[in-house]
């Protein structure tokens, strides 16, 4: 049994998350994950899910009753999702920590927008003509 | 020229993001994107970057001076990053909108944690033995 299971059960007790009413009104993450089979689509969704759990764990980091459980689960996420790659985890953390209300961050983000957009589609590296074929056509002239 | 370029230039003017000092202290996103070549790694990072921009745009959605620019860029992101797939965009939006301080959301998230963790690694579907090999060995028994 993976080590996170026991620790997740401990968190369930702490949050009363084993109660029957928890399942009311559908799932947060599980139904969404079931929708996406392609690895790249799954990563888009899992990225948001992992950042949610990291924020949740941060809010409870000083609670001694669950500290060990939280740390074990975070370690397991680092192995499974980030392939034990600290650089990947660090880059991810940087992205999740930027403040959207900080005017310097806003200016930088807008400054970088054109280059970010140019890289968004998987075929971004193969030039405009090939990418437009991916969109099944070209953009009409303005 | 892709349509977002003109609109991103308009945003640059609005945010004074063309000023030389904007480049001080490194980039927010570009250096991180340069680090990751694998499509699934890029999606992990781009997922966070796109959610940042969506939050930023939400904060300025009522400003008439940039409304058209913001809407054009959002449409372009939907075509390029979400493949014009509204279900993908809707699932993404649901994930970004969950409140980490809502106790019902916390309980649901903890309730789902074991199953989410079980699916985190790319090889989650190919059985325990194969997956453990992907992690370059097995975990020592507890």
């Amino acid at each position: 049994q993976d080590p996170y299971v026991k620790e997740a059960e401990n968190l369930k007790k702490y949050f009363n998350a084993g109660d029957p009413d928890v399942a009311d009104n559908g799932t947060l993450f599980l139904d969404i994950l079931r929708n996406w089979k392609e690895e790249s689509d799954r990563k888009i969704m899992q990225s948001q899910i992992v950042s949610f759990y990291f924020k949740l764990f941060k809010n409870f980091k000083d609670d001694q009753r669950i500290q060990k459980s939280v740390e074990t689960i975070k370690e397991d996420i680092n192995v499974k999702f980030f392939n034990s790659n600290k650089k990947k985890r660090d880059d991810f953390e940087k992205l999740t920590n930027y403040s959207v209300t900080d005017s310097n961050v806003q200016r930088k983000a807008v400054h970088e927008l054109i280059q970010v957009m140019a890289e968004l589609s998987p075929a971004a590296k193969i030039g405009k003509r090939k990418r437009s074929q991916m969109f099944r056509g070209r953009r009409a002239s303005q | 020229q892709d349509p977002y370029v003109k609109e991103a230039e308009n945003l640059k003017k609005y945010f004074n993001a063309g000023d030389p000092d904007v480049a001080d202290n490194g980039t927010l996103f570009l250096d991180i994107l340069r680090n990751w070549k694998e499509e699934s790694d890029r999606k992990i990072m781009q997922s966070q970057i796109v959610s940042f921009y969506f939050k930023l745009f939400k904060n300025f959605k009522d400003d008439q001076r940039i409304q058209k620019s913001v809407e054009t860029i959002k449409e372009d992101i939907n075509v390029k990053f979400f493949n014009s797939n509204k279900k993908k965009r809707d699932d993404f939006e649901k994930l970004t909108n969950y409140s980490v301080t809502d106790s019902n959301v916390q309980r649901k998230a903890v309730h789902e944690l074991i199953q989410v963790m079980a699916e985190l690694s790319p090889a989650a579907k190919i059985g325990k033995r194969k997956r453990s090999q992907m992690f370059r060995g097995r975990r020592a028994s507890q």
Partner: antibody, heavy 124, light 112 residues
């Protein structure tokens, strides 16, 4: 009230070209993707092409790409479908259909609003 | 090649329930929304279900839509069948980037 009105259909010979038009009203036209869908007499529905709203990206059915071109004029609330090298099997009723507003996560449904269609007949 | 396969015809008596299936040949049915359209002779198609299971305003709750990932199919269910429901029904979904796909259509006959 959302309205889409197609025009420009008619009888043409095989090999000829034809442009059909669609004029829209009752909504902010530039916000929405527009689809062209056709229906041959007594047959099912076949998607032809789509053009995005503000960005004007064009998407085509694999079987028609190269012969058909979609374009739009947001200032005049109009979309066009230019068809070249027409064949007998292109004979159909051509519908203009409103798509999503892809900048709005609460957009009205895709393909909710249809025009009445314009009939294109290709025959010698 | 992506296909949405529907039965050619379905029939039922007034007041009964019928189900029209729409099977996706490849790719996951859950990864794209499914819409359903009703088309009466001489009219343009009219949407009866959008985004898997939602009804546009004016469509009675006798019409319902669902998606089943295990069979990779979507279904349109019409309960309390009425003679006015007699029409052709088309499912619709997507593939690739904004590639729209229609099923071949199902002719619904209300018996009696």
């Amino acid at each position: 009230e959302v309205q889409l009105v197609e025009s420009g259909g008619g009888l043409v010979k095989p090999g000829d070209s034809l442009t059909v038009s669609c004029v829209a009203s009752g909504f902010t036209f530039s916000n929405y993707f527009i689809h062209w869908v056709r229906q041959a007499p007594g047959k099912g529905l076949e998607w032809v092409a789509t053009i995005s709203g503000r960005t004007k990206y064009m998407f085509y059915s694999d079987s028609l790409r190269g012969r058909f071109t979609v374009s739009r004029d947001n200032a005049n609330n109009s979309v066009y479908l230019h068809m070249s090298s027409l064949r007998g099997e292109d004979t159909a009723l051509y519908y203009c259909v409103r798509g999503y507003d892809h900048s709005d996560s609460n957009s009205a449904a895709d393909l909710l609003h249809w025009g009445r269609g314009t009939l294109v007949t290709v025959s010698s | 090649n992506f296909m949405l396969t529907q039965p050619l015809s379905v029939s039922g008596y007034p007041g009964k329930t019928i189900v029209i299936s729409c099977v996706r040949s490849s790719g996951s049915v859950a990864s794209h929304y499914v819409q359903w359209f009703q088309q009466r002779p001489g009219s343009a198609p009219a949407m009866v279900i959008y985004e898997d299971s939602h009804r546009p305003s004016g469509i009675p709750d006798r019409f319902s839509g669902s998606v089943d990932a295990s069979s990779n199919s979507a279904s349109l269910t019409i309960s309390g069948l009425k003679t006015e429901d007699e029409a052709d029904y088309f499912c619709q979904s997507y593939y690739g980037n904004n590639q729209v796909l229609f099923g071949g259509g199902t002719k619904l006959t209300v018996l009696g």
